[in-house]
């Protein structure tokens, strides 16, 4: 047998060399096209396992999009034809609740999750006999990467986990599926930085294949929570990084989500974007915002992919994406996942399993309507899966997809066998579809959520609500005490009420200055290197949020540390959520908060509000009868007509859909 090269096994403490054999009847003369279904026999630790695989048809679309850049920095859009891809999911015969994510591109490579262990398999380098190495994922050496909890805490947590008798995976999955009965779809966009691209030999195909493999692994981990990962796009920074990656993880994350909001969202709709970087941050494996998956401004994370395998890296991305999905760290909580450590353990453990706590955190997100964007089954031009009627994704060429024949019995509008609409139906799904008919134009489909939002209406000829828009960033709100920022009026009292209950309000300015000048975890202007930054007086209103009149103590799945600081006759209340260094602190003042005359908070500094690029003269552009929306179009008051609010009409904008229906005036807002 060929001996594995040192590089291939240097990260393993133990492994076996095996030769899988194929059980399918059809002979495979050439490597492509790949079979839709295939079975193999593989050996692991003296046992033979039969594995059954089917192509993961929900993973990629017909027009899967890849963005790259040429030498001049011009954006290039490519739609590689990879419907017949080689990425599979499946199960181990006779092993209850097993799951597999494998690619069969050049040999077998991927992950097998059995009841009590996870295995990695990959082709043996330079073997001409289809030999592979198989190893327990526990036997992979990993750098001690972290998410900000000290090693002592991690050791203590691990020791506690070993003492407990974990519930079986069966029990866990049964409990989870009862909690999360409805499938959620995460439309994931991956961005690969220049250094990682260089590390892959500047081979775009290799980067693409690796990221599709990664998405398949993620899908195999998230499926236990009834969450599907749909990779909607990939961007490779082939010509140079489009953000500054100098500084700490927090700086890079901030730069990335700002870039995403400005450049990526407009190009390709998605729920979360994850940046893949080669550069490390001194032991921090990644960083992401918590509970922001549907946010225009913060649905993102950064993930360090250095000298580790894609299998190990998958658990880092699963962890950071988990934060976006509302999951906090497991450390210090009563969590179990049927393994020594779980994906949301802060120690980047390489785990494949989500814990009971993660399931509960995600459920909280969905109950609080933080996951509304995950309910839509991706549209044909966005869902990059090889078309397949019955997968509950409306693929190219389909009008609807109600799923299995049994599920389709309950769908009055969709013909299950053809994925076409029934003869009498105009539509089968969507916010503007009811009883198989388009709702009339002027039907409210997305109400105004704050004074900085605008409503959207059905247009009468589509099942979809108009795209979400809001008042342009920088428009004054709260009696000129604040600015609109991403559809919310960002002011201090409201932020205190979110954390400390409806009676709370912002503490006096002296509190902010006094507490935030300290540069500790309760008062700071961010984190740099390994220490908290003290706030200069001019930035104090952009550091840790200070509140008073506190009557409720917050609980967001974890119990935060709360500090009271006496200051000139009042008590200033602040909070440290102790979420770890890979999670931006929700106890800080929000970005976009007005911190002075003509100034807003950005990156914990009080900077000129001109950075918001507000350029709307409502008197000139909207004739004093409307406001500019996030597309820089007028949204007119009731009584005035778009586009410029200068003639009589029924309000709204060119983006909102018609606000009025001639057949039924009662529909008007």
């Amino acid at each position: 047998a060929a001996r594995p090269g040192f590089q291939q096994t240097s990260h393993l403490s133990s492994y076996e060399i095996i030769t899988p054999w194929r059980l399918t009847r059809e002979r495979r003369e050439a490597p492509r096209p790949y079979s839709k279904q295939v079975s193999y026999v593989i050996q692991a630790e003296g046992k033979e396992h039969i594995i059954h695989l089917e192509r993961n048809k929900d993973l990629l679309p017909e027009d899967f999009v890849v963005y790259t850049y040429n030498k001049e920095g011009t954006l290039i859009t490519d739609h590689p034809n990879i419907q017949n891809h080689c990425h599979y999911r499946g199960y181990v015969e006779g092993v209850h609740n097993s799951s597999i994510a494998l690619s069969d591109c050049f040999g077998l490579r991927g992950l097998l999750h059995l009841e009590n262990a996870s295995y990695g398999i990959e082709p043996l380098q330079n073997s001409s006999h289809f030999e592979h190495i198989i190893y327990r994922m526990d036997d992979v050496y990993k750098e001690p990467l972290k998410c900000g909890v000290s090693n002592k805490d991690i050791e203590k947590e691990t020791a506690k986990d070993e003492e407990e008798e974990p519930p079986s995976m069966t029990q866990l999955l049964r409990r989870r599926r009862a909690v999360l009965p409805q499938t959620r779809y995460v439309e994931l966009f991956i961005v690969v930085d220049k250094e990682r691209y260089d590390m892959m030999g500047r081979n775009q195909t290799a980067v693409r294949e690796e990221m599709i493999l990664l998405a398949n692994y993620l899908d195999s981990m998230y499926i236990m929570l009834n969450i599907r990962i749909v990779l909607v796009g990939l961007e490779i920074w082939t010509n140079g990084n489009l953000i500054n990656i100098v500084g700490g993880a927090g700086d890079v994350l901030g730069n990335f989500v700002q870039w995403r909001e400005k450049f990526l969202i407009t190009r390709r709709r998605h729920d979360s974007a994850q940046l893949v970087l080669k550069k490390g941050f001194g032991g921090t494996a990644g960083m992401a915002f918590v509970g922001t998956v549907c946010s225009r401004s913060h649905a993102g994370g950064i993930n360090v992919f250095g000298q580790i395998t894609v299998e190990t890296f998958a658990s880092i991305v699963a962890h950071e994406l988990g934060h976006n999905l509302g999951m906090n760290h497991d450390d210090g909580r009563d969590c179990s996942c049927g393994a020594k450590s779980c994906i949301m353990n802060s120690g980047a453990s390489g785990s494949r399993n989500f814990s009971s706590c993660s399931a509960e955190d995600f459920e909280k997100l969905t109950l609080n309507k933080g996951g509304n964007c995950l309910l839509n089954i991706p549209k044909p031009d966005e869902a990059y899966s090889a078309p397949s009627c019955g997968n509950k994704l409306v693929d190219a060429g389909e009008e609807c997809d109600c799923g299995t024949p049994k599920e389709c019995e309950l769908d009055p509008c969709c013909e299950g066998s053809t994925c076409k609409l029934k003869s009498f139906a105009e539509c089968a799904y969507g916010d503007c579809c009811k009883d198989c008919r388009f709702l009339p134009g002027g039907t409210l489909c997305r109400g105004k959520t704050s004074e900085c939002d605008v409503p959207e209406y059905c247009n009468g000829s589509s099942q979809f609500c108009q795209p979400d828009v809001f008042i342009q960033n920088g428009y004054p709100c709260q009696n000129n005490k604040a600015y609109c920022y991403n559809g919310m009026c960002q002011y201090y009292d409201a932020q205190c009420q979110v954390i400390f209950g409806s009676k709370a309000k912002a503490a006096p300015k002296d509190c902010f200055i006094e507490v935030n000048s300290k540069g500790d975890r309760f008062g700071n202007c961010g984190f740099s290197g390994n220490e908290y930054k003290k706030c200069a007086t001019g930035n104090a209103l952009c550091g840790k949020l200070q509140c008073e009149n506190v009557q409720e103590i917050p609980v967001f799945g974890i119990v935060p540390a709360i500090i009271q600081t006496p200051s000139r006759g009042t008590k200033c209340w602040g909070v440290d959520f102790q979420l770890g260094s890979d999670v931006p602190d929700p106890g800080m003042v929000n970005e976009g908060t007005k911190c002075g005359a003509g100034k807003i908070c950005r990156n914990f500094q009080c900077v000129d509000a001109s950075v918001l690029n507000y350029d709307c003269d409502v008197q000139k552009k909207c004739h004093g009868h409307g406001v500019c929306n996030s597309n820089k179009n007028c949204h007119c008051e009731n009584g005035w007509a778009p586009p410029n609010c200068e003639t009589k009409g029924y309000g709204g904008s060119v983006d909102s859909g018609p606000t009025y229906n001639e057949m039924n005036t009662a529909l008007r807002d």
Partner: nanobody, 127 residues
Framework: EVQLVESGGGLVQPGGSLRLSCAAS????????IAWFRQAPGKEREGVSC????????YYADSVKGRFTISRDNAKNMVYLQMQSLKPEDTAVYYC????????????????????WGQGTQVTVSS
Amino acid sequence: EVQLVESGGGLVQPGGSLRLSCAASGFTLDSYAIAWFRQAPGKEREGVSCISSSDGTTYYADSVKGRFTISRDNAKNMVYLQMQSLKPEDTAVYYCAADPELVTVCRPGWGPAYDYWGQGTQVTVSS
């Protein structure tokens, strides 16, 4: 550009009165909290009186309560400090300060957490 200019200071005998004025430009007065501070030689700056932007609530330091009155004329963009029964210990440079009051700055025991400051006007109480 926000500017504050104080006037009305001078030399006055104990028991006398003065009216300090603060002319504001570059912003509308009614959306700002305005305060008067003073600093005597060799001492820390202390708050004398302030008027809140939100509801016009006024506060006074214990040492001036009943003797000083703060008021504002939004139409003229002016703030006044009427000082009566002056004492030698009121001798100091008096400063006018303004803040957009995004969080409270005008309150009992307030500190100098104001964004904009005037140059000051000298008040001397001496016989």
